[in-house]
């Protein structure tokens, strides 16, 4: 009778992660008597995948009943495939022997390749906020994909970016891979509503790329512009001075009025108006009792925005030149409010 051959008809099998792999194997004869075993890899370090008679292999099932008389189909199914299962699988026939069974004949092997989807890209920006005209770096990471080929693109508000560097690790053969990319983005004053998008395309995604986003509102700081103006007299001996704080982001802002360098009042921006570009405006006003001053008054609006060093704008109030106006003689006071309460 012809000597037994072990036939593995599939040279390679491609399976998606999470699916079941079927590895086919048939023998051409029932002789010699002995079990079939499946291994991943060859040589002394090979890994036992299935032994039909003993051991624990919860992920493996046989395609046919191996104990049926005259069965020569030794195909197996491996469930819940992960990238770690990739490799070459050998169906090996053993001959019963003493003390141990002896390897008799091996199949040619079936290479199992696993396609695994990349994880959702995670985009992270700089730890500290930056101001317009500065360049900031964003990183994008995705893990666990196989095969290694992958495409990564960066966008800002739908416009593709070109200033980025990408690495896929490891460089050599691996069960799965990771991608890491760093993009440089120049901030503009209009970027409060902007988004940076990292897009990853891979064979497992069937043309539907994964995206990770970062909002530039988390990254940008737009410093305010200040304007101090003197309003017409509201009452006898009183001058209304306003400080317009324009186009700032984020909202965290504290304003201090100084009269001739002395703190008059401090307030925190509360009811602000939002501009179309996402920045904020706010206004504070101060009633100055002119009669309390003999000399000219230097009024300073000092603003501390988002924990940054204070910026200020001053206005010189000429006491001597101030005309008197008819009207009720209210008590001299310093009051402040936001835009809503001026009129």
């Amino acid at each position: 009778e012809e000597e037994l051959q072990v036939i593995q008809p599939d040279k390679s099998v491609l399976v998606a992660a999470g699916e079941t792999a079927t590895l086919r194997c048939t023998a051409t004869s029932l002789i010699p008597v002995g079990p079939i075993q499946w291994f991943r890899g060859a040589g002394p370090g090979r890994e036992l995948i299935y032994n039909q008679k003993e051991g624990h292999f919860p992920r493996v099932t046989t395609v046919s009943d191996l104990t049926k008389r005259n069965n020569m189909d030794f195909s197996i199914r491996i469930g819940n495939i992960t990238p770690a299962d990739a490799g070459t699988y050998y169906c090996v026939k053993f001959r019963k022997g003493s003390p141990d069974d002896v390897e008799f004949k091996s199949g040619a092997g079936t290479e199992l390749s696993v396609r695994a989807k990349p994880s959702a890209p995670v985009v992270s920006g700089p730890a500290a906020r930056a101001t317009p005209q500065h360049t900031v770096s964003f990183t994008c990471e995705s893990h666990g994909f196989s095969p290694r080929d992958i495409t990564l693109k960066w966008f800002k508000n739908g416009n593709e970016l070109s200033d980025f560097q990408t690495n896929v690790d490891p460089v050599g053969e691996s069960v799965s891979y990771s991608i890491h990319s760093t993009a440089k983005v120049v901030l503009t004053r209009e970027d409060v509503h902007s988004q940076v998008i990292c897009e990853v395309a891979h064979v497992t995604l069937q043309g539907d790329p994964l995206r990770g986003t970062a909002n530039l509102s988390e990254t940008i700081r737009v410093p305010p512009t200040l304007e101090v103006t003197q309003q017409p007299v509201r009452a006898e001996n009183q001058v209304n001075v306003t400080c317009q704080v324009r186009k700032f982001y984020p909202q965290r802002l504290q304003l201090t009025w100084l009269e001739n360098g002395n703190v008059s009042r401090t307030e925190t921006a509360s009811t602000v108006t939002e501009n179309k570009d996402g920045t904020y405006n706010w206004m504070s006003w101060l009633l100055v009792n002119v009669s309390a001053h003999r000399d000219d008054v230097k009024l300073t609006c000092q603003v501390e925005h988002d924990g940054q060093p204070a910026v200020s704008k001053s206005h010189d109030l000429k006491v001597s030149a101030h005309p008197k106006e008819q009207g009720s003689n209210t008590a001299a006071e310093n009051t402040g409010s936001n835009e809503r309460n001026i009129y």
Partner: antibody, heavy 113, light 108 residues
């Protein structure tokens, strides 16, 4: 559900023979090797041997070779372990196990004069 | 015959502590054929870890196994009261199959 149910405790005199049974359910006994393991009181596990019920091929540990016989009856899905020329040091719990993964509850054999 | 030597013979620890149990083989054992069993008094052994590092069904993730060649380890990251038992390593790489003498993990 895989189950291995062993026969009850035995008390034997030195020189006697004991035969323990292990009836299995939830699988066909022909599909797996059936192993036997000894555990003397307060001691560790010791592998005795195994049978391939499909063709009755057996392997035994050198320590038990010549005194132990493992058999199987595929019609009743039962494995047996027979130990002869009993001595006091054979006093132990004997376990059957299916392919190293599932174990019977154990059978206590006491050898005493 | 491959002799498996487990150390220590007894390990006294408190719940919450990390336990490291060792199993040393007199000659090389393929990692596929190295199993660990847990046994409690009056009970049959239970398969705990198979093929060196794979947890049997229902075994908590605080257990892990590692090793290759002649040196294998079972680790419990943070001991729970139910983990105190005897643990045996077992090789079925070549006949006669052998067990280690066991490590008794007891409450300190």
């Amino acid at each position: 559900e895989v189950q291995l149910v062993q026969s009850g405790a035995e008390v034997k005199k030195p020189g006697a023979t004991v035969k323990i049974s292990c009836k299995v359910s939830g699988f066909n006994i022909k599909d797996y090797y059936m192993h036997w393991v000894q555990q003397a009181p307060g001691k560790g596990l010791e592998w005795i041997g195994r049978i391939d019920p499909e063709d009755a091929e057996t392997k035994y540990a050198p320590k038990f070779q010549g005194r132990v016989t493992i058999t199987a009856d595929t019609s009743t899905n039962t494995a047996y372990m027979e130990l002869s020329s009993l001595r006091s040091e054979d006093t132990a719990v004997y376990y059957c196990d299916r392919g190293l993964a599932y174990w019977g509850q154990g059978t206590l054999v006491t050898v005493s004069s | 015959e491959i002799v498996l030597t487990q150390s220590p013979a007894t390990l006294s620890l408190s719940p919450g502590e990390r336990a490291t149990l060792s199993c040393s083989a007199s000659s090389s054992v393929s990692s596929s054929y190295l199993y660990w069993y847990q046994q409690k008094p009056g009970q049959a052994p239970k398969l705990w870890i198979y093929s060196t590092s794979n947890l049997a069904s229902g075994i908590p993730a605080r257990f892990s196994g590692s090793g290759s060649g002649t040196d294998y380890t079972l680790t419990i990251s943070s001991l729970e009261p139910e983990d105190f038992a005897v643990y045996y390593c077992h090789q079925w790489s070549s006949y006669p199959y052998t067990f280690g003498q066991g490590t008794k993990l007891e409450i300190k």
